[in-house]
């Protein structure tokens, strides 16, 4: 079964701690129709003349997932738990299309970084997505921030179009992803 949430409009500002900018280059708040033009929902359901979405309010739909760009600062672990409380997980990037979509979203926040669902226990152990799946560097490279002072950056965030490792305790924003099945 799938919950159908009515799409709401927001502004390109913070609302309840969430970044509501959509997928337009000038980052102006699109109408629902312009949102459809830029990020086509795969299967939006119309009910009583109102376009409904399989995503909750304030979440952005792209292909088969809903995304929430949280603008509350948290450690990686705190961000993971915040996503869990919303019935989702930290972002897992599955394709180059999805990566492009995410880069487009976060590029409008050039001063901010966003945790994604990739971590490892220590440098000798491979990166692991939050769901336990393997990480393949074919999709993207992780640029290291390791220094002698901070030798163990074991969590991953995205900043504009670059993905970096980072100390897991550093407070940052985050991206939650909720996959839906039709």
């Amino acid at each position: 079964t799938m919950a159908i949430w009515r799409s709401n409009s927001g502004s390109n500002t913070l609302e309840n701690g969430y970044f509501l900018s959509r997928n337009k280059e000038n980052h102006s708040q699109p109408t629902q129709s312009s949102l459809e033009d830029s990020v086509t929902p795969t299967k939006a359901v119309k009910t009583t003349g109102v376009l409904s979405s399989p995503c909750p309010p304030n979440w952005i739909i792209y292909e088969k997932s809903c995304y929430l760009f949280s603008m509350s600062l948290n450690s990686w672990d705190g961000s993971k738990r915040q996503c869990w409380q919303l019935g989702s997980n930290l972002l897992k990037i599955d394709s180059s299309n999805e990566l492009g979509f995410i880069v487009k979203q976060v590029s409008s926040q050039p001063d901010n970084s966003f945790w994604i669902g990739l971590s490892r226990p220590q440098t000798e152990v491979p990166w692991l997505w939050e769901d336990g799946s393997t990480f393949s560097s074919n999709l993207f490279q992780i640029r290291t921030t390791a220094t002698q002072e901070n030798p163990s950056p074991n969590c991953v965030w995205i900043h504009v179009s670059v993905i970096y490792d980072q100390l897991c305790s550093v407070p940052s924003y985050s991206i939650c992803e909720k996959k839906f099945s039709m």
């Epitope: 226990p121 220590q122 000798e124 152990v125 692991l128 769901d131 336990g132 393997t134």
Partner: antibody, heavy 118, light 107 residues
Framework: QVQLVQSGAEVKKPGASVKVSCKSS????????IHWVRQAPGQGLEWMGW????????NYAQKFQGRITMTRDTSISTAYLELSRLRSDDTAVFYC???????????WGCGTLVTVSS | DIQMTQSPSSVSASVGDRVTITCRAS??????LAWYQQKPGKCPKLLIF???SLQSGVPSRFSGSGSGTDFTLTVSSLQPEDFATYYC?????????FGPGTKVDIE
């Protein structure tokens, strides 16, 4: 649903080799590490190593180095464990398990009993 | 290798009891710890991962806590199906290692 189905029990002589299979279904085989864990009769659990089914990369526990080989056949979503130069103290149930969050083992095969006896 | 120790090695308890099992790592493992339940002749079942995250489908009477070297598995109200052996496992460094197990049996 996720399922791991293992091959049947084996009886081997000391010095021989054994190859155990683990067929996966219900998920994308190449997306998750497969671990092998053994349990001697009445004993605890012992991690032997893993294979990344996508790349074929392996990581073996040091104590098994030189006589353990993990392989996979992605066309039939099956992982294999081969243990050579068997000794009587290798008698154990061998489990395959699929990786889950935080490198835990979320799904297990039902085990393959390997008996090493002369 | 990281050594994992568990205490007690066995515990006798009754239905409805609160049972606590502890696991200690020989060095810090952050939160990279899992708990499993195993019944005789059966394969292990994941209960807790990441030290405190409940695996999907596991009853909420199971909970995990701890970080670093000291961890706890708690069963808030023991049920008949909970009599089993419980293992902790570290996933911080290779080789991954298990504790020796704690057997929970009927008092």
């Amino acid at each position: 649903q996720v399922q791991l189905v293992q091959s049947g029990a084996e009886v081997k002589k000391p010095g021989a080799s054994v190859k155990v299979s683990c067929k996966s279904s219900g998920y994308t085989f190449t997306d998750y590490y497969i671990h092998w864990v053994r349990q001697a009769p009445g004993q605890g659990l012992e991690w032997m190593g893993w294979i990344n089914p996508n790349s074929g990369d392996t990581n073996y526990a040091q104590k098994f180095q030189g006589r353990i080989t993990m392989t996979r056949d992605t066309s039939i979503s099956t992982a294999y464990l081969e243990l050579s130069r068997l000794r009587s103290d290798d008698t154990a149930v061998f489990y395959c398990a699929r990786n889950s969050g935080s490198y835990s083992f979320g799904y297990w095969g039902c085990g393959t009993l390997v008996t090493v006896s002369s | 290798d990281i050594q994992m120790t568990q205490s007690p090695s066995s515990v006798s308890a009754s239905v409805g009891d609160r049972v606590t099992i502890t696991c200690r790592a020989s060095q810090g493992i952050s939160s990279w710890l899992a708990w499993y339940q195993q019944k005789p002749g059966k394969c292990p079942k994941l209960l807790i991962f990441g030290a405190s995250s409940l695996q999907s489908g596991v009853p909420s009477r199971f909970s995990g806590s701890g970080s670093g070297t000291d961890f706890t598995l708690t069963v808030s109200s023991l049920q008949p199906e909970d009599f089993a052996t419980y293992y902790c496992q570290q996933a911080y460094s290779f080789p991954f290692t298990f504790g020796p197990g704690t057997k929970v049996d009927i008092e």
